[in-house]
């Protein structure tokens, strides 16, 4: 009810002899901070006095401490929230009722806690999981309900007396809820461990012995078995007898039924610990072992391999590949049953004993196409010789071999001509399927093997052809030696080297990229008037009439081929030059007259120089002069001077006249 | 060395003639190398060359067509100088105007009159 | 008349930088081609005559070249003074015609 004073701490505390006690504690008082404070040791009420009596162990009030046995009690509390306690070094006559008797201003309270002290140090307590299994991890716990901060102690786990590997966690509280040390171990049982001994043990913090406590371990397990057999190599031969004996060597909980297994499949009817064989054959040779079951799972015996000897079966061949590139290697396997392994083999090609051969595998390093044909073996033990079986075909694959391109026209063969070619071979394995034709073009295939070049071309130089299975072979290029009228006819200037000009001497060179026959012809023509017929056309002084269009012929004994027209040009300086006058040479004073300077000239004049009567040059570069108003001083004769990039042409004089107008004449 | 003069008024009414004179010293009007220009120059028309005389055996003139009909430049021996005449003015002809020789280039030019027609 | 064509009208650089403008002419006027540049309240002054030659007392950071229809002007390494409108003029025949100019600003 809301009349109590609220305190939390463990009901009660254990300890022994000589350890000590750490009391964790908290409270809240009805009103204020506490006052006074006694612990008391078993109190007891007395009604007379309305106060309490028994041993003080420890006093606090507001005038001071009582000294009492406050060394060995110890109150570490506050006034309002914590009332932890310690008793240090603890006694057997500690046991019983600890009283804690507090007062605040206007309140008191009682509170009770146990004490249960032994005489030596009690034990630790192991916990186990209700059922522990073979190789299933398991948590061992050794829990003490006994922790005190200044008795330090530690709890160690051992195995038939010897310390455990397995590292353990130990953990500690000390809180109002618990106080307890606990440590824990994960631990992997074998079946051996079944029935073995495991101790939680006490110690001081120096490792001295304090106290244990023991468990027995139970370790549920599938049955561990051995077998026997006889003959103790389990080799024999057909015909003769094998015993095999399964024996438990351990087993919990007990063994419920037994069964024997070969290859790891069940064996009928053989449900005892005893497996008799009679008259074995071959088939019966293989892996043997027993299974013995409980309700943990069935537990199998190590296997016995059992060996029934016989003399080797028919042989067969596996060849390593097949077909077989020519050039590759290849490896034969003769695959013969026996027991023991054969020790000798004889191998046959197409029937004929192949010498030297002794081994199980033949290897061919480079396979030729003569290695073709059946291989056979037989095989050999100490129990006899197997007999031959229907062996093997070995395909050997090879390109086409000796490929010929063939011409099939006659000779010489002209540009524009149609040409046939066919390609040959020897033999081939597989056959062939489809021909290659080296250069590619756009060609008819009339037939395999056959091509047919329509319009030859000038350039179609070499033609090569392959045969192909699932390789090709191809074979030496064919020259086609197309002959054609001459090529790429240019005219190519030689001399000069630079621009012609009017007076130099001039070389033109008629070139030719190519001509089959080799033998040719020149022509050389201007607006089509027959020049010469030398390579060269020469000009010892060129003039201005020479310019025109060229062209050039070459011809051989298929055709001829004219050049482009190539366009001579002459560079002069300006010449005929003449001033002419508009609107005539002859003026009235006012009107304007224009002087044009006319002129022949390549290249064309850049800029003109007016001259007049005087030779005095007029502030004009134009081809045009133009007077305006003109007047009656400007009469006299004028000339012009024209200037290209060869040189200067000047004209001869040429006379304005200009005359008074009606108006001056009037005036006079 | 060669220096031009300019002299003239700064305003003339428009239809009015525009009368400017260029003093040369340094050469003479007469030489026979060079040429005499006028040039003018507004915001409207950037630099517009007008006109020019000059002396070979004779005296030449040589006029810009968009002022060839009211155009007139003389040569004075006797003063060393020579003279610009623009009839009927209108404000279009508002400008800066330049005299300038000609030899190999405009190599001299006056210090220019700034023309408002108004 | 023949017409000439400056370009750019306007120009930014700075100072040490180098400059270039061009003059196309409508029809070939051979080497005849001069240069002016003018500073605002000035009469223009010449600098190149006849194309690529530099008029005397010019410096030779100024540079010109082309023939026919085709002309370029250069500063080498613009300096403070050289900010100002740059004109081309063809004396090849009469009209005489400029450029309509190009102004050379400060960056």
């Known amino acids: 009810d809301s009349s109590k004073w609220v305190f939390e701490h463990p009901e009660t505390l254990y300890a022994w002899e000589g350890a000590c006690v750490w009391i964790p504690c908290t409270y809240r008082a009805l009103d204020g901070d506490l006052e006074s404070f006694i612990l008391f040791h078993n109190p007891e009420y007395n009604k007379n006095t309305s106060k309490f009596d028994g041993t003080r162990l420890y006093e606090s009030t507001k005038d001071g401490k009582v000294p009492s046995e406050q060394k060995r009690v110890q109150f570490l509390g506050d006034k309002n929230k914590n009332c932890t306690l310690s008793i240090h070094p603890v006694h057997l006559n500690d046991s019983g009722q600890l009283g804690l008797r507090m007062e605040s201003k206007t309140e008191k309270w009682m509170e009770r806690i146990h004490l249960n002290v032994s005489e030596r140090p009690f034990p630790p307590h192991i916990q186990l999981p209700p059922e522990i299994q073979e190789s299933q991890e398991v948590t061992l716990t050794c829990l003490l309900n006994f922790s005190c901060y200044g008795y330090p102690i530690q709890l160690q786990w051992l195995l038939e007396g010897v310390p455990m590997r397995q590292a353990a966690v130990t953990s500690t509280s000390l809180t109002i809820k618990s106080v307890f040390t606990r440590s824990e171990l994960k631990f992997s049982p074998q079946w051996s461990h079944h029935g073995k001994i495991v101790t939680c043990q006490l110690q001081d913090a120096d490792g001295k012995f304090l106290s244990n406590d023991t468990v027995q371990l139970n370790v549920k397990h599938t049955p561990k078995l051995e077998i026997k057999v006889t003959p103790s190599d389990a080799i024999v031969r057909e015909g003769d007898s094998v015993t095999m004996t399964c024996e438990v060597s351990s087993s919990n909980p007990e063994y419920t039924t037994v069964s024997w297994l070969k290859d790891g499949t069940s064996l009928k009817k053989q449900n005892t610990f005893t497996l008799n064989l009679r008259e074995v054959t071959k088939d019966q040779s293989g892996k043997y072992c027993c299974q013995v079951s409980n309700d943990v799972g069935p537990g199998r015996s190590e296997e016995v391999f059992l060996q029934v000897q016989y003399a080797p079966e028919p042989s067969t061949v596996q060849i390593l590949h097949s077909p077989a590139v020519e050039g590759s290697q290849v490896e034969f396997l003769c695959m013969s049953l026996a027991n023991p392994l054969p020790t000798n083999y004889t191998w046959y090609h197409n029937g004929k004993e192949m010498q030297g051969r002794t081994e199980e595998k033949v290897h061919i390093p480079k396979i030729l196409p003569w290695h073709a044909g059946t291989y056979s073996c037989v095989a050999e033990n100490i129990l006899g010789t197997g007999q031959r079986g229907p062996g093997a075909e070995l395909d050997v694959q090879y390109p086409p071999k000796k490929v010929t391109t063939v011409i099939q026209n006659p000779m010489p063969i002209r540009e524009g001509d149609t040409v046939t070619l066919s390609c040959n071979y020897n033999s081939s394995n597989p056959s062939v399927t489809r021909y290659e034709w080296k250069p590619h073009g756009a060609w008819e295939e009339p037939s395999l093997g056959v091509l047919k070049i329509q319009n030859v071309g000038w350039d179609n130089t070499t033609i090569a052809c392959a045969a192909c299975n699932s390789w090709c072979s191809w074979a030496s290029p064919v020259a086609l030696n197309v002959q054609y009228a001459p090529r790429d006819v240019r005219v190519r200037k030689i001399k000069p080297l630079s621009e012609i000009h009017s007076g130099n001497s001039v070389s033109l060179q008629c070139d030719f990229s190519s001509s089959h026959p080799k033998e040719v012809q020149f022509f050389w023509e201007k607006n089509g008037r027959l020049l010469g017929k030398e390579s060269q056309l020469n000009f010892d002084s060129i003039s201005p009439e020479d310019a025109g269009s060229y062209s050039c012929w070459v011809n051989n004994s298929i055709g001829q081929t004219a050049s482009k027209a190539w366009t001579l040009e002459v560079l002069y300086a300006p010449r005929r030059l003449r001033v002419s006058m508009s609107p005539g040479d002859q003026v009235m004073e006012g009107k304007s007259a224009t002087l044009t300077c006319e002129s022949d000239a390549n290249p064309p004049v850049s800029h003109y120089t007016w001259f007049d009567w005087n030779n005095q040059s007029l502030p004009y570069h134009s081809q045009k002069l133009r007077l305006e108003p003109v007047k009656v001083q400007h009469s006299g004769a004028y000339w012009c001077q024209g200037t290209n990039s060869v040189g200067k042409g000047r004209s001869p004089l040429s006379t304005l006249t200009v005359y008074y107008s009606p108006e001056t004449i009037g005036r006079r | 060395q060669v220096q031009l003069q300019q002299s003239g008024p700064g305003l003339v009414e428009p239809s009015q003639t525009l009368s400017l004179t260029c003093a040369i010293s340094g050469d003479s009007v007469s030489s026979d190398s060079v040429a005499w220009n006028w040039i003018r120059q507004s915001p409207s028309r950037g630099l517009e060359w007008l006109g020019r005389t000059y002396y070979r055996s004779t005296w030449y003139n040589d006029y810009a067509g968009s002022v060839k009909s009211r155009i007139t430049i003389n040569p004075d021996t006797s003063k060393n100088q020579f003279s610009l005449q623009l009839n009927s003015v209108t404000p279009e002809d508002t400008a800066v105007y330049y005299c300038?020789?000609?030899?190999?280039?405009?190599?001299?030019w006056g210090q220019g009159t700034m023309v408002t027609v108004s | 008349d023949i017409v000439m064509t400056q370009s750019p009208s306007s120009l930014s650089a700075s100072v040490g930088d180098r400059v270039t403008i061009t003059c196309r002419a409508s029809q070939s006027i051979s080497s005849y081609l001069n240069w002016y540049q003018q500073k605002p309240g000035k009469a223009p002054k010449l600098l190149i005559y006849d194309a690529s030659n530099l008029e005397t007392g010019v410096p030779s950071r100024f540079s010109g070249s082309g023939s026919g229809t085709d002309f370029t002007f250069t500063i080498t390494s613009l300096q403070p003074e050289d900010f100002a409108t740059y004109y081309c003029?063809?004396?090849?025949?009469?009209?005489?015609?400029f450029g309509g100019g190009t102004k050379v600003e400060i960056k």
């Open positions: 300038a020789r000609d030899r190999n280039g405009m190599d001299v």
């Open positions: 003029q063809q004396s090849y025949t009469t009209p005489l015609t």
